[in-house]
Interface confidence: medium
């Protein structure tokens, strides 16, 4: 494997070379972590502290902004209830969402009490608005988390916003919510650990199942404890969950509560030496690379280790096939607290627990018409057995030699002369981006990895906690607690002055054109356009 | 017609033991969390403890924690509370009520009570 | 001492309309917890009166009524009857690990 990045550039050689714009926060502000893109727009809207942006894509130092706080009344009841005044008694966002093409939809910790409202942007980008609805705010409960610390994943689609969230002050009663909309609110079950264990959640996508959109499915992505008996002593594990959209949930004891929500874990391991796996189980983010088929798209995960001792990070691949088998496989199940969970062997009732009611795969038309022996079965069977593992069975990268973990993904697929490329941007805890491409060896999947650049992409050592990429503008845009980034996806003119350089780079935004490194454009018609992705051989490409 | 019944209360001097009981019916036992709420006579409620569908979540109100332990057993549509240590001040009515999840989203309300049961604690 | 606050006492005339307050702190009502209310005829078990702070279950007259704002809550009841005559509990939950709390209890007493 090539861990020696090809490029390694520090904040100075970012800034003199023109290569990053950072934004570098307010004095009031904080907490740059929920990002929203938009493209058609050319906007990239930030949630930090007390504040909501909107920034150019083409310069980040173009900026609108939106002040959010909380009144001093409530300010000061966090701080009678023992918060910490700067880093807790404030207005947090941790929800935007596109509401509609003229609204979107904010909701932030309120000072641990979360508080909702909308975001007038406009009709169109030549409107030139970005104003708070000052009129209509709601209850955040269910959307935003009380507590600042506490991850969310949320995705507003058709009038609806599914939020995995703590939906407390303690940050104790975590559940993925369906509110908005015009139907009661949906949530999963309350004080059961077989459900969701103390998760963190990471993200939320719609997939669809099948051409008949009854089929589409919600995935969240977090991880949290390993039930008792699943694991010898205290564990992680990464989960996928799967929701359907039209679940409106169940009758008895499943009235507004989740109906069809299953989950599974997520395997990223090594084989180590003693014959024990090395697992990366702290799930940190995930990216869908949706290609051709919206269907099937490829799930990047990025995953660091839970020990102490050994400090790692990977990156794995999975297939949505390999979760619908997954799915469709055996439940987990256990006769009792003491006993080891085994795959359930009795009769699954009809229509199989998970399966979205459509008249694609089964003649009902409702979750609330489901029999008592389904709502029976799915509220005690909510886990899989079988767990998804990465595609060939392995992680794609791994660091665990470096004073850093991995904490964000983004992935761009570029094509190139020999063939298309996922470009990998992986952000770390120290607030460096690695840029990693992943080369097929034999057969697509099976991967060679190339670390590309290693850029320092802020002043200060600060993680990285969120991250957009712009195919439109071929940038990168990089949020943290002290500030937003912006960078380009490709720096060709650094990799050298000669053609040899530039094709043993290996980057598949970059080509040499005869007299210098540059930009490849796949339907520029340039026979002297020399690269070589699979190989990096410049001998057979560079006649100098 | 959902019923709740308690029984078991009655005289006890302290740091005497009962086991309150309550007998469910007309609705599905199993899928319900439920808990006990009790009142001295002449004051007000107050919550004591509640048991969620599965026995999976179990919490006490900290006058009693440590000394009543709560249990159900869903073959039987019945509820326990197991009483140790009996003080004075744990003379009350004491109420079986199940938690209405359906109605109230977040917190559950108690949508069905039993008549109760009297437990003294005197010497 | 109640977490939650209730005026000891109301009274109104029949046909009156009255109302019961209820007042919590930023760490039960003020944290965004559910509010319910319960009447508790003489003798008899409390019963569900308003759920989710404005929500009625079935068989509850309209004249009750039910709000929310801020750290507080309130139960109003019109066109008082003489059977309206009870002791009404306001509840929800206490952080920090949440639990039920009741308020003290309000004594309605319909004069004449």
């Known amino acids: 494997k090539n861990n020696v990045p090809r490029l390694k550039l520090s904040y100075k050689e970012m800034l003199e070379s023109n290569n990053v714009i950072t934004f570098n926060g307010l004095a009031n502000s904080s907490s740059y972590h929920t990002f929203l893109l938009d493209e058609e727009r050319s906007r990239l809207y930030v949630g930090a502290k007390d504040h909501i942006f909107s920034f150019d894509l083409v310069n980040i130092k173009d900026f609108q902004k939106i002040v959010w706080p909380v009144s001093y009344t409530r300010r000061d009841e966090c701080k009678w209830a023992g918060k910490d005044i700067l880093k807790e008694c404030a207005n947090f966002i941790k929800v935007l969402k596109a509401y509609n093409q003229t609204h979107l939809y904010a909701c932030g910790t309120g000072a641990f009490h979360p508080i909702c409202t909308y975001i007038e942007i406009g009709h169109h980008p030549e409107d030139n608005i970005f104003k708070l609805e000052n009129s209509h705010f709601e209850n955040g409960r269910g959307k935003s988390p009380y507590d600042p610390k506490l991850l969310t994943a949320s995705l507003l689609i058709d009038g609806e916003l599914y939020s995995g969230t703590a939906a407390d002050f303690m940050g104790r009663d975590f559940a993925i919510f369906r509110t908005l909309g015009h139907h009661h609110p949906i949530r999963t079950e309350q004080h059961d650990s077989r459900w969701l264990n103390d998760p963190k959640f990471i993200s939320a996508h719609l997939i669809s199942e099948s051409d008949n959109p009854e089929d589409d499915k919600v995935y969240f992505f977090f991880r949290e404890n390993a039930i008792d008996g699943e694991h010898s002593g205290k564990a992680t594990h990464a989960r996928i969950g799967q929701i359907c959209k039209n679940d409106f949930g169940g009758h008895r004891s499943l009235v507004n509560k989740w109906t069809t929500f299953l989950k599974a874990r997520l395997i990223c391991s090594v084989p180590g030496p003693n014959g024990i796996d090395t697992h990366f189980d702290e799930l940190q983010d995930v990216f869908l690379m949706n290609f051709k088929d919206p269907k099937n798209p490829v799930v990047y995960g990025v995953f660091t280790t839970s020990s102490n001792i050994f400090k790692g990070s990977a990156v794995c691949m999975y297939s949505m096939s390999d979760v619908r088998r997954v799915f469709l496989g055996p439940y987990a199940h256990r006769d009792g607290p003491n006993y080891q969970w085994v795959p359930y062997q009795g009769r699954v009732p009809y229509p199989r627990p998970g399966t979205c009611p459509s008249k694609t795969f089964g003649g009902f038309d409702s979750t609330k018409d489901l029999p008592d022996d389904v709502i029976t079965f799915a509220r005690s069977h909510p886990a899989m057995y079988n767990p998804v593992f990465p595609m060939n069975n392995r992680p794609i990268v791994i660091k665990t030699d470096v004073n850093y973990q991995f904490t964000q993904i983004v992935v761009d697929r570029v094509d190139a002369e020999d063939g298309q490329y996922d470009v990998m941007f992986i952000g770390t805890d120290v607030g460096t981006v690695l840029k990693v491409v992943s080369i097929p060896k034999e057969t697509w999947y099976d991967l060679e990895e190339v670390l590309l650049e290693e850029m320092t992409v802020f002043r200060e050592p600060t993680a990285i906690s969120a991250m957009e990429l712009s195919t439109k503008q071929q940038q990168l845009y990089i949020g943290s607690t002290a500030g937003v980034a912006q960078l380009p996806l490709h720096r060709c003119d650094i990799y050298g002055k000669a053609c040899a350089e530039c094709c043993l780079a290996r980057d598949p935004y970059c080509a040499w054109d005869g007299s210098a490194c540059s930009r490849y454009f796949p339907t520029a018609k340039r026979a002297t356009r020399a690269q070589d992705i699979r190989n990096g051989d410049p001998l057979t490409h560079c006649s100098d | 017609e959902v019923q709740l019944l308690e029984s078991g209360g009655g005289l006890v001097q302290p740091g005497g033991s009962l086991r309150l009981s309550c007998a469910a019916s007309?609705?599905?036992?199993?899928?319900?969390?439920m808990n006990w709420v009790r009142q001295a006579p002449g004051k007000g409620l107050e919550w004591v403890s509640g048991i969620s569908w599965n026995s999976g979540w179990i919490d006490y109100a900290d006058s009693v924690k440590g000394r009543f332990t709560i249990s159900r057993d869903n073959s039987k549509n019945t509820l326990y509370l197991q009483m140790n240590s009996l003080r004075a001040e744990d003379t009350a009515v004491y109420y079986c009520a199940r938690s209405g999840y359906s109605s109230s989203w977040f917190d559950p309300d108690f949508d069905y009570w039993g008549q109760g049961t009297l437990v003294t604690v005197s010497s | 001492q109640s977490v939650l606050t209730q005026p000891p006492s109301v009274s109104g005339a029949p046909g009156q309309r009255v109302t019961i307050s209820c007042t919590g702190s930023?760490?039960?009502?003020?944290?965004?917890?559910?509010v319910h209310w319960y009447q508790q005829l003489p003798g008899t078990a409390p019963k569900l009166l308003i759920y989710?702070?404005?929500n009625r279950p079935s068989g509850v007259p309209d004249r009750f009524s039910g709000s929310k704002s801020g750290t507080s809550a309130s139960l109003a009841i019109t066109g008082l009857q003489a059977e309206d005559e009870a002791d009404y509990y306001c509840?929800?939950?206490?952080?920090?690990?949440?639990?039920?709390?009741f308020g003290g209890g309000t004594k309605l007493t319909v004069l004449g």
């Open positions: 989710g702070a404005s």
């Open positions: 930023s760490s039960n009502i003020g944290a965004g917890y559910d």
């Open positions: 509840s929800s939950y206490e952080g920090p690990n949440p639990y039920v709390v």
């Open positions: 007309g609705f599905d036992f199993s899928s319900y969390e």
